[in-house]
């Protein structure tokens, strides 16, 4: 039994780091392997993570961490019974993948304006809470070419757009993801998408203009 692709880990900078790796053949990750991890610091404690399968030869482990600070460094030992398959280290602050935003809602009751709001995935006492920026993806269910990204570079988890920038009378979906420049993070996963029917009253001049053609 050998490791084909060494573990790579990302941290949500809150309580969970996720490590993935591939073995050289089909493996029952949860019965055959254990990932031991320990903070490199005075009087720290060794923890054991039981991996799950992630495809035939792939394994994934969710490492629980009480808290994360930028100096944290963990040793990682991958064991198959009494055999040490791989030894490495992981610094969570250097491999951050934020949690996905949640509760995406589209408010269509503001006149001719779409207000999209979502929730910051971190509590206010987490360092990332005040450092997230977002990307909002809106697309048409009817027209694959009607696909757009709005970058939200301010801290407020909301986006206002004129309903008229989208086509009227058709359904759209939206989703949002986050990243934090301060830790040069990767993007989070996309939030679950939400759907709405885009309809707005065109201005009178436009109606008038249409009647003359």
């Amino acid at each position: 039994m050998k490791v084909l692709q060494e573990p790579t880990c990302v941290s949500d900078y809150m309580s969970i780091s996720t490590c993935e790796w591939k073995m050289n053949g089909p493996t029952n990750c949860s019965t055959e392997l254990r990932l031991l991890y320990q903070l490199v610091f005075l009087l720290s404690e060794a923890h054991t993570c039981i991996p799950e399968n992630n495809g035939g030869a792939g394994c994934v482990c969710h490492l629980l961490m009480d808290d994360v600070v930028s100096a944290d460094n963990y040793t990682l030992d991958l064991w198959a019974g009494q055999q040490l398959l791989w030894k490495g280290s992981f610094k969570p602050s250097e491999h951050v993948k934020p949690r996905a935003p949640g509760n995406l809602t589209v408010h269509t009751n503001v006149s001719d304006t779409l207000l999209l709001t979502w929730s910051n995935p971190y509590p206010p006492d987490n360092y990332l809470y005040n450092h997230l920026t977002y990307a909002v993806n809106i697309w048409s269910e009817n027209d694959p070419a009607d696909f757009r990204i709005y970058n939200v570079t301010y801290l407020e988890p909301s986006l206002r757009i004129a309903a008229s920038t989208l086509k009227s009378g058709i359904s759209y979906r939206a989703r949002v993801r986050a990243w934090a420049q301060c830790y040069n993070t990767t993007w989070s996963e996309w939030s679950p998408s939400t759907k709405w029917h885009n309809s707005y009253r065109e201005p009178f001049e436009q109606h008038h203009h249409h009647h003359h053609h």
Epitope: F41, L42, L43, S44, E45, D66, D67, V69, S70
Partner: antibody
Framework: QVQLVQSGAEVKKPGASVKMSCKAS????????MHWVRQAPGQGLEWIGG????????SYNQKFKDRATLTADRSSNTAYMELSSLRSEDTAVYYC????????????WGQGTLVTVSS | DIQMTQSPSSLSASVGDRVTITCRAS??????LNWYQQKPGKAPKLLIY???RLHSGVPSRFSGSGSGTDYTLTISSLQPEDFATYFC?????????FGGGTKVEIK
């Protein structure tokens, strides 16, 4: 809410030993470190040492290495500190303080045990 | 041992004042700097850990900053319950050491 309850005040003669206790109201004692810090009357704070109750690992301030002994009883979530060869300058309030395992900040403190060393 | 020097050793301030306490380490402590509040006859309480992290339940008027050897505790608007003694502590190098304290008194 985590609580640390320490044993009562002690009066000792120079050269004697004292053993004090600290009971923690935590679900699992092994996920923490128990440290001991003292404060002489009107003075600042001084770290004595720390213990990982799960594996028994200890770390001491060299100043106390030969006189302080830290132990724990996992079954009762209780930590102990024994200080030997007492002298008058050991008169102080002794605090137990809890950190998450491997952390360097004292998140929870006991109410303190006053130890008076006097002939 | 790393020496932790707090300044001032005492200060007088009024409710609503902005108060700043500094702590200087004798060598780089890599942000392992914590702040505690202590009232007479009571145990210390953790306010800020790892330079700037607010401990749970601590009001947001308390904040911390700094790096290397120089660190600061700021109380943005002093409240009556904030009159106490404040200690810094480094947890980077054994033995862990504390500053001498700053007593915040009512003006």
């Amino acid at each position: 809410q985590v609580q640390l309850v320490q044993s009562g005040a002690e009066v000792k003669k120079p050269g004697a030993s004292v053993k004090m206790s600290c009971k923690a109201s935590v679900y699992t004692f092994t996920g923490y470190n128990m440290h001991w810090v003292r404060q002489a009357p009107g003075q600042g704070l001084e770290w004595i040492g720390g213990l990982h109750p799960g594996n028994g690992d200890t770390s001491y301030n060299q100043k106390f290495k030969d006189r302080a002994t830290l132990t724990a009883d996992r079954s009762s979530n209780t930590a102990y500190m024994e200080l030997s060869s007492l002298r008058s300058e050991d008169t102080a309030v002794y605090y137990c303080a809890l950190t998450t395992a491997g952390r360097a900040w004292f998140a929870y403190w006991g109410q303190g045990t006053l130890v008076t060393v006097s002939s | 041992d790393i020496q932790m020097t707090q300044s001032p050793s005492s200060l007088s301030a009024s409710v609503g004042d902005r108060v700043t306490i500094t702590c200087r380490a004798s060598q780089d402590i890599s942000n392992y700097l914590n702040w505690y509040q202590q009232k007479p006859g009571k145990a210390p309480k953790l306010l800020i850990y790892y330079t700037s992290r607010l401990h749970s339940g601590v009001p947001s008027r308390f904040s911390g900053s700094g790096s290397g050897t120089d660190y600061t505790l700021t109380i943005s608007s002093l409240q009556p319950e904030d009159f106490a003694t404040y200690f810094c502590q480094q947890g980077n190098t054994l033995p862990w050491t504390f500053g001498g304290g700053t007593k915040v008194e009512i003006k």
